[in-house]
């Protein structure tokens, strides 16, 4: 099943201590999906969309950008035939970068 769309939600982090907000959205015919956020291949957070919605926002507390490294991806799962869970392809990556300190 098709990959979700992913984006950073403002306010964007300006340091590693700032929280990170990431939205993931499934295609229109997959409301109420279960979403998983990954960073560097490891699960960071799981959220379920409301039954009438096709997306979620992951709110990661400050400091969560330190480890593991690498870009964020998200994926969603839906119940298919015979109540078996089907997983989507992974989203495109989203990289979180911080402004270079000027001191």
């Amino acid at each position: 099943i098709p990959a979700p769309s992913i984006r950073l939600v403002p306010p964007y982090p300006s340091s590693q201590e700032d929280p990170i907000h990431i939205a993931c959205m499934a295609p229109g015919n997959f409301p109420g999906a279960n979403f998983t956020l990954y960073r560097g291949g490891q699960v960071v957070q799981l959220l379920q969309a409301p039954t009438d919605q096709r997306g979620v926002t992951f709110n990661l507390s400050g400091g969560s950008s330190k480890a593991p490294g690498g870009p964020f991806h998200c994926q969603y799962g839906v119940l298919g035939e015979l109540n078996q869970s089907q997983l989507s392809d992974l989203s495109e990556p989203v990289n979180v970068s911080f402004p270079v300190p000027t001191w």
């Epitope: 769309s5 939600v9 403002p10 306010p11 929280p19 907000h21 959205m25 997306g55 926002t57």
Partner: antibody
Framework: QVQLVQSGAEVKKPGSSVKVSCKAS????????ISWVRQAPGQGLEWMGG????????YYAQKFQGRVTITADESTSTAYMELSSLRSEDTAVYYC????????????WGQGTLVTVSS | DIQMTQSPSSLSASVGDRVTITCRAS??????LNWYQQKPGKAPKLLIY???SLQSGVPSRFSGSGSGTDFTLTISSLQPEDFATYYC?????????FGQGTKVEIK
């Protein structure tokens, strides 16, 4: 039913500042973004910036950086937009609006505040 | 900044016509696109979010499609109350830029 009620029309001199308020009533304030969009007479829509009251950090379009300040007071469910160093090109209707955090889609708009900059 | 270009800038149509408005982004915005309708002297109204989801309370004659850089808003059968200006908006990254608008007028 959530409503956003904005302060009244303003007439300002070039070089001065204006502060527009936006009070939310009848619904949740803090778990959405409040954005500000302006529309000059006969022109299109221009996004200025926004704030998520729950997070407290404002963000701005580069065009307005340094000239606009967006704040929010969760205790009164009120957001504010202050624009300084006004010029005639800032004459516009200023809208506050409530954005869904997933889609950044604006489902609820204030009634608009006309700011006229004239000497 | 991501530029959004709508076409046409204006069109004339009759009640019952099928109307299509296109919006092109200067770079890939995936499905992060919203459509609004605005009538003179009024605040805009959300029609479509996430490129294709119909906002609650919006008539089903409105539909949105597209992904990447090219998007379409379709009104399947134009009604008298649909004569207005329509805007697309990208929300992939700030600033959340709008298209210049498409004015739908009565033929």
């Amino acid at each position: 039913q959530v409503q956003l009620v904005q302060s009244g029309a303003e007439v300002k001199k070039p070089g001065s500042s204006v502060k527009v308020s936006c009070k939310a009533s009848g619904g949740t304030f803090s778990s959405y973004a409040i954005s500000w969009v302006r529309q000059a007479p006969g022109q299109g829509l221009e996004w200025m910036g926004g704030i998520v009251p729950k997070f407290g950090t404002a963000y701005y379009a580069q065009k307005f950086q340094g000239r606009v300040t967006i704040t929010a007071d969760e205790s009164t469910s009120t957001a504010y937009m202050e624009l300084s160093s006004l010029r005639s090109e800032d004459t516009a209707v200023y809208y506050c609006a409530r954005e869904n955090l997933v889609y950044s889609a604006i489902a609820i708009w204030g009634q608009g505040t006309l700011v006229t900059v004239s000497s | 900044d991501i530029q959004m270009t709508q076409s046409p800038s204006s069109l004339s149509a009759s009640v019952g016509d099928r109307v299509t408005i296109t919006c092109r982004a200067s770079q890939d915005i995936s499905n992060w696109l919203n459509w609004y309708q605005q009538k003179p002297g009024k605040a805009p109204k959300l029609l479509i979010y996430g490129a294709s989801s119909l906002q609650s309370g919006v008539p089903s004659r409105f539909s949105g499609s597209g992904s990447g850089t090219d998007f379409t808003l379709t009104i399947s059968s134009l009604q008298p109350e649909d004569f207005a200006t329509y805007y697309c908006q990208q929300v992939t990254s700030t600033p959340f830029t709008f298209g210049q608008g498409t004015k739908v007028e009565i033929k």
